[in-house]
């Protein structure tokens, strides 16, 4: 139904608290460099305006679209050009072009210091002084660093953050109470951010059909008892919600998400028995609970997939009459039977099935052509299974740090043009997937690994698009969303790469490395390893092992020495010479 004033409608639906939070997130995600105080001032102005529209929907400007109101607010900032440069050029455009222009200026990697956590005492003092302002500051700091964070979920994490502080600031040992709670919130929020970023990339780079396919697969795995028609209804609503959030229409997104949660709770009998525990919770927790819900049990007596998708003589007729519905049904039926497969696998299988029908349905005897389709799709299942098995074996053998090193070598060989800090960052992220997934039971390992890899590779692709350095990375990132991981896996040593000349500086260490925290020490060593591979991309595994062994012995010796700096000065050049000889 149409409302006279969109902003009044959303204010009424969301309530003042959530409304203000979402306005703050919107501004922080678009204006990532502005100080917190400036945003607070704008939030108050927008809120006062919304209240005026609630009182009189016909009041001046109340009928404008919310995006237009936000755009007008942003364009009225006097320091816009000096702070944001060409973003100010967006203000010369008319909506919807202005909105698109703002979106293009969102920075996925803003030049901001890491979000450091103050000491528990300082945290609690600030929280007790003014907890609304404190939580507002949390929303601001997270939003400006994660400009695509799923806004209603961020409100949920802010609530969790507030609850943790409320409880722990009264505890005798604040640090012991707070640290594990805040660590857990941080870890979950980072994963949530990456998941939403993948959804936005899927919509923006590959279109609505790609996102809908992803959603059908995911929801069919979670709700295997729901009918395809029910899954399709939810997917349509979910697509609208996701598009709104990815587009920066956060008030609409949060409101529509509430509506979707309400719909699912009203129809839980035909969706999933697991919804019961979510539907009794308050708004934010309800939607979060549904998002994280455990999958329902598979219905018993599911017929063999081949009955409808191979043996049925009407396959090509059904494919011609309603291609997307037929393929959607295939994806639904396949996904609900295979909760242990990753989304990527399921989509590759559906893509393979589609390609087979495209070919076979054009033949005189289609059935004879596609009769063995499931056998032909088997490699799409075997390849990731084998890859996960091999990598988890390597992880078990080497441990997380050693596994990261192996990945640093592997990915430097694949894309040596990528900067050393970036390669180390991604090797470490990819290596941590081993920790997250390899200890899981066989049935969960596969989906855990590939689903996490999709998030990490998406981040790599987004940052690489900003400053492209490798054609091979661009190709893997842009050709197909579902084939990204197999594409990267298939890359081997880049034969076109001209090895980097040897710079002793890259391998020169000082005594300060001995006092660094373990993580930073590892990063320094991994930077040297990557530089080494860039210098000798075709070095054998044995050569690399020898060099790394010598390197570790050198660090241990010098860090244990009485005169550390003298040891580094004396033995450093010897190590460099020895490494060069080993790799010659």
């Amino acid at each position: 139904e149409a409302h006279k004033s969109e902003i009044a409608h959303r204010f009424n639906d969301l309530g003042e608290g959530h409304f203000k939070g979402l306005v703050l997130i919107t501004l922080s995600q678009h204006l990532q460099k502005s100080p917190f105080e400036e945003h607070v001032k704008l939030v108050n102005e927008v809120t006062d305006f919304a209240k005026a529209c609630v009182a009189d929907e016909s009041a001046q400007n109340c009928g404008k679209a919310i995006a237009t109101l936000f755009g007008d607010k942003v364009c009225a900032i006097p320091s816009l050009r000096e702070t944001y440069g060409e973003l100010a050029d967006c203000c010369a455009k008319e909506d919807p072009d202005r909105v698109e222009c703002f979106l293009q200026h969102k920075d996925d990697n803003p030049n901001l210091p890491p979000f450091e956590r103050p000491e528990p005492e300082a945290l609690c003092t600030a929280f007790k002084e003014n907890n609304d302002r404190f939580i507002g500051h949390y929303l601001y700091e997270v939003s400006r660093r994660h400009p695509y964070f799923y806004a209603p979920e961020l409100l949920y994490y802010a609530e969790k953050y507030k609850n943790a502080l409320t409880e722990c600031c009264e505890a005798a040992d604040k640090a012991a109470c707070l640290t594990p709670k805040l660590d857990a919130i941080k870890e979950k929020a980072l994963v949530s951010s990456a998941q939403q970023r993948l959804k936005c990339a899927s919509l923006q780079k590959f279109g609505e059909r790609a996102f809908k396919a992803w959603s059908v697969a995911r929801l069919s795995q979670k709700f295997p008892k729901a009918e395809f028609a029910e899954i399709s209804t939810i997917v349509t609503s979910l697509t609208k919600v996701t598009k709104e959030c990815c587009h920066g229409d956060l008030l609409e997104c949060a409101d529509d998400r509430q509506e979707l949660a309400k719909y699912m709770c009203e129809h839980q009998d035909s969706i999933s028995s697991k919804l019961k525990e979510c539907c009794v919770k308050p708004t934010l927790q309800k939607a979060h609970c549904i998002l994280e819900i455990q999958r329902d049990e598979l219905p018993t007596e599911l017929p063999d997939l081949a009955v409808d998708f191979v043996e049925d003589k009407e396959v090509c007729k059904n494919f011609a009459e309603a291609k997307d519905v037929f393929l959607g049904t295939f994806l639904y039926e396949y996904s609900r039977r295979h909760p242990e497969y990753s989304i990527g696998m399921l989509l590759r299988i559906a893509k393979g099935y589609e390609a087979k029908l495209e070919k076979c349905c054009a033949e005189a005897d289609p059935h004879a052509c596609y009769a063995k389709v499931f056998d032909e799709l088997q490699p799409l299942i075997d390849e990731p299974k084998k890859l996960v098995q091999q990598n988890c074996e390597l992880f078990d053998k080497l441990g997380e740090y050693g596994f990261q090193n192996a990945l640093a070598v592997r990915y430097t060989q694949k894309a040596p043009q990528v900067s050393t800090p970036t390669l180390v960052e991604y090797a470490r992220k990819l290596g941590s997937v081993g920790t997250k997934c390899c200890s899981l039971p066989e049935t969960e390992r596969l989906s855990c690994t590939e689903n996490y890899l999709a998030l990490i590779l998406n981040r790599l692709c987004i940052l690489h698009e900003k400053t492209p350095v490798s054609e091979r990375v661009t190709k893997c990132c842009t050709e197909s969303l579902v084939n990204r991981r197999p594409c990267f896996s298939a890359l081997h040593v880049d034969e076109t790469y001209v090895p980097k000349p040897f710079h002793a500086d890259s391998f020169t260490f000082h005594a300060d490395i001995c006092t660094l925290p373990e993580k930073e020490k590892q990063v320094k060593k991994q930077m040297a390893l990557v530089e080494l591979v860039k210098h000798k991309p075709k070095a054998s595994e044995e050569q690399m092992k020898t060099v790394m062994g010598d390197f570790a012995a050198f660090l241990k010796k010098c860090c244990d020495a009485d005169n550390k700096e003298a040891c580094f000065t004396e033995d450093g050049p010897k190590l460099v010479a020895k490494c060069q000889a080993t790799l010659a």
Partner: nanobody, 115 residues
Framework: EVQLVESGGGVVQPGNSLRLSCAAS????????MSWVRQAPGKGLEWVSS????????LYADSVKGRFTISRDNAKTTLYLQMNSLRPEDTALYYC????????SSQGTLVTVSS
């Protein structure tokens, strides 16, 4: 919406010829193999002939081999069945279908062969 409309049927004497047409719309015609199937009075559906999307491959039931010729014009999105040396046992409702489908999703065209 997929539509298949057959035409060209009629009453003929044994040994004579008929040419059936099937006008297709609502899908990418050239991407799909097409078939003719028929249903004699009081009998089940019987497959007659199939042709690939490009028109290069054809298949025929033994009962019509050497007498019937299937063809297509992708530009006109039309399927044809040239029937020569017709016999009384060819009397049936003829339907065109997508792929190897053995179903009636259209009205069909009646062919009666009788002296």
């Amino acid at each position: 919406e997929v539509q298949l409309v057959e035409s060209g049927g009629g009453v003929v004497q044994p040994g004579n010829s008929l040419r059936l047409s099937c006008a297709a719309s609502g899908f990418t015609f050239s991407s799909f193999g097409m078939s003719w199937v028929r249903q004699a009075p009081g009998k089940g559906l019987e497959w007659v002939s199939s042709i690939s999307g490009s028109g290069s491959d054809t298949l025929y039931a033994d009962s019509v081999k050497g007498r019937f010729t299937i063809s297509r014009d992708n530009a006109k999105t039309t399927l044809y069945l040239q029937m020569n040396s017709l016999r009384p046992e060819d009397t049936a409702l003829y339907y065109c279908t997508i792929g190897g489908s053995l179903s009636r999703s259209s009205q069909g065209t009646l062919v009666t062969v009788s002296s």
